[in-house]
C-alpha cells in the first residue's frame, strides 16, 4: 500500500544495483559536484552494455538476494485494514476515457524509463509533464484527437450503462431532481480522474517489477 | 551496437508502388519514435514522415500525404514506408533514423528509390 | 508552416580559417528545437548541434551554435580538412517529430 512504512521495500533489479554503486563511486571522486543526472544515466547505460556477464554477476547475485528477501518480507506483510477492501465498482461500468496527456504518457514512458533507469516513479511523472508542456498546441493534437473520440464513447456506452440502470439504481427508482444527478456525474468524474491517476500509478510500479535489464 | 539499415528501394514506373523496410538492432525499438527522411539527387534533406513508439501515432510531409503510408512492428523490429503513386519527384535516398539517448541520433545508410519511365 | 533558410548557399574558405553559417526561421522558434547537421558526400547526415547551442555526442569544440528567436548561427572557429561538407539546420517539432530543415550551405575548399 502506499505510504505504509512497514510494507517491505521493493526490490532492486541488478541495474539498479550497478546505478546505486555507480552514483556512491561518484560521490566518492566528486563529493562536491551536482549530478547531471540526464548525464549520468547516459554514462551508466553505456558501461552496463559494455559490461561482461561475469561483470555484471556480482549485481546479478545481489539483485538475487534482494528478490529473496523481498519475497520473504512479503510473506509476513500485513497490510493495514481496509487497505485491501476498495469501495465497490461495476466491473462492467463503462472505464473512463483517458486524458490526452495520459494517452502521451503511455506512448512516451517506456523511453523515460528505459533511458533513465534510475528516475523514481515521480522523477518520470515529473520529466512526461514537461515533455508534454514544451510540446506546441498543434503537437498536442493527435493525441487530443483521440482523447476526444474515446471521450465521446464514453459517453455513449456510460449512457447506455446508465439506461440499462446500475445494479441498486432499479430498486430505488430512475427520477432524479437534475441537480443532484449533475452533483453525482461531477463526484463521478472526480473519483474517475483519482482512479485513473491510481491507476497509471499502480501500472508504474508493476512496470517497474516487470522490466528486465538489457 | 545501434544501427539502421533500410532496405527495398528499386527502380519503379510512376504510379507504380514499393514498400521500404529499415531494420532496427541494438536498442529497445519499441520505446523511440522512428522517422524517414529523403534527399533527391544533388538536393537537401526532406523530412518524410515519422511514427511513435507504439505506432498510434503518425505524422506526413504534405508532399506525400495520402500516399505514403509509415507503420511499425515492435516484435519485429522493423520500419516500413508504404509508397503508391510513386512520381518522378519521389526520386530519392531514403533515410530512417530514429533519436536515441539526448539526442544522439541514429541514422542508416539509405536505399535509393528511383521513379522513371 | 515554418521555413528555414540558410545562408550563404556556398562557403569558400581556407583549412585554419573561421566560418560562420546562418539560419533564419519564417517565425519565432524555441531554441529547444533547433539543430545542425553535417553532411559529406555518400554519407548519411550526422547531428553537430542541439537545442541551438549545445555539442552532441563526438562533436569537437570547434564547433558552436548561438541564437535565439528567428536567427541562428553554427560557429567553426578553426576550419579542419575534414569540416568541408554540407550544413543544414533543422528546426523539430515532437511527438512524433516532424522536421524542418534548410536548404543547406556548403562548406568547401578555396
Known amino acids: 500500500g502506499k505510504g505504509d512504512p512497514k510494507k517491505p521495500r521493493g526490490k532492486m533489479s541488478s541495474y539498479a544495483f550497478f546505478v546505486q554503486t555507480c552514483r556512491e563511486e561518484h560521490k566518492k571522486k566528486h563529493p562536491d559536484a551536482s549530478v547531471n543526472f540526464s548525464e549520468f544515466s547516459k554514462k551508466c547505460s553505456e558501461r552496463w552494455k559494455t559490461m561482461s556477464a561475469k561483470e555484471k554477476g556480482k549485481f546479478e547475485d545481489m539483485a538475487k538476494a534482494d528478490k529473496a528477501r523481498y519475497e520473504r518480507e512479503m510473506k509476513t506483510y500485513i497490510p493495514p485494514k481496509g487497505e485491501t477492501k476498495k469501495k465497490f465498482k461495476d466491473p462492467n461500468a463503462p472505464k473512463r476515457p483517458p486524458s490526452a496527456f495520459f494517452l502521451f504518457c503511455s506512448e512516451y514512458r517506456p523511453k523515460i524509463k528505459g533511458e533513465h533507469p534510475g528516475l523514481s516513479i515521480g522523477d518520470v511523472a515529473k520529466k512526461l509533464g514537461e515533455m508534454w508542456n514544451n510540446t506546441a498546441a498543434d503537437d498536442k493534437q493527435p493525441y487530443e484527437k483521440k482523447a476526444a473520440k474515446l471521450k465521446e464513447k464514453y459517453e455513449k456506452d456510460i449512457a447506455a450503462y446508465r439506461a440499462k440502470g446500475k445494479p441498486d439504481a432499479a430498486k430505488k427508482g430512475v427520477v432524479k431532481a437534475e441537480k443532484s444527478k449533475k452533483k453525482k456525474e461531477e463526484e463521478e468524474d472526480e473519483e474517475d480522474e483519482e482512479d485513473e491517476e491510481e491507476e497509471e500509478d499502480e501500472e508504474d510500479e508493476e512496470e517497474e517489477e516487470d522490466d528486465d535489464d538489457e | 551496437e545501434v544501427q539502421l539499415l533500410e532496405s527495398g528501394g528499386g527502380l519503379v514506373q510512376p504510379g507504380g508502388s514499393l514498400r521500404l523496410s529499415c531494420a532496427a538492432s541494438?536498442?529497445?525499438?519499441?520505446?523511440?519514435?522512428m522517422t524517414w527522411v529523403r534527399q533527391a539527387p544533388g538536393k537537401g534533406l526532406e523530412w518524410v514522415s515519422s511514427i511513435s513508439p507504439s505506432g498510434g501515432y503518425t505524422k506526413y510531409a504534405d508532399s506525400v500525404k495520402g500516399r505514403f503510408t509509415i507503420s511499425r512492428d515492435n516484435s519485429k523490429n522493423t520500419l516500413y514506408l508504404q509508397m503508391n503513386s510513386l512520381r518522378a519527384e519521389d526520386t530519392a535516398v531514403y533515410y530512417c533514423?530514429?533519436?536515441?539517448?539526448?539526442?544522439?541520433?541514429?541514422w542508416g545508410k539509405g536505399t535509393t528509390v528511383t521513379v522513371s519511365s | 508552416d515554418i521555413q528555414m533558410t540558410q545562408s550563404p548557399g556556398t562557403l569558400s574558405l581556407s583549412p585554419g580559417e573561421g566560418a560562420t553559417l546562418s539560419c533564419r526561421a519564417s517565425q519565432s522558434v524555441s531554441s529547444t528545437y533547433l539543430a545542425w547537421y553535417q553532411q559529406k558526400p555518400g554519407q548519411a547526415p550526422r547531428l553537430l548541434i542541439y537545442e541551438a547551442s549545445k555539442r552532441a555526442t563526438g562533436t569537437p569544440a570547434r564547433f558552436s551554435g548561438s541564437g535565439s528567436g528567428t536567427d541562428f548561427t553554427l560557429s567553426i572557429s578553426s576550419l579542419e580538412p575534414e569540416d568541408f561538407a554540407v550544413y543544414y539546420c533543422q528546426h523539430r517539432h515532437n511527438w512524433p517529430p516532424q522536421w524542418t530543415f534548410g536548404q543547406g550551405t556548403k562548406v568547401e575548399v578555396k
Open positions: 533514423t530514429t533519436e536515441f539517448y539526448d539526442y544522439l541520433d541514429v
Open positions: 541494438g536498442f529497445t525499438f519499441s520505446w523511440y519514435d
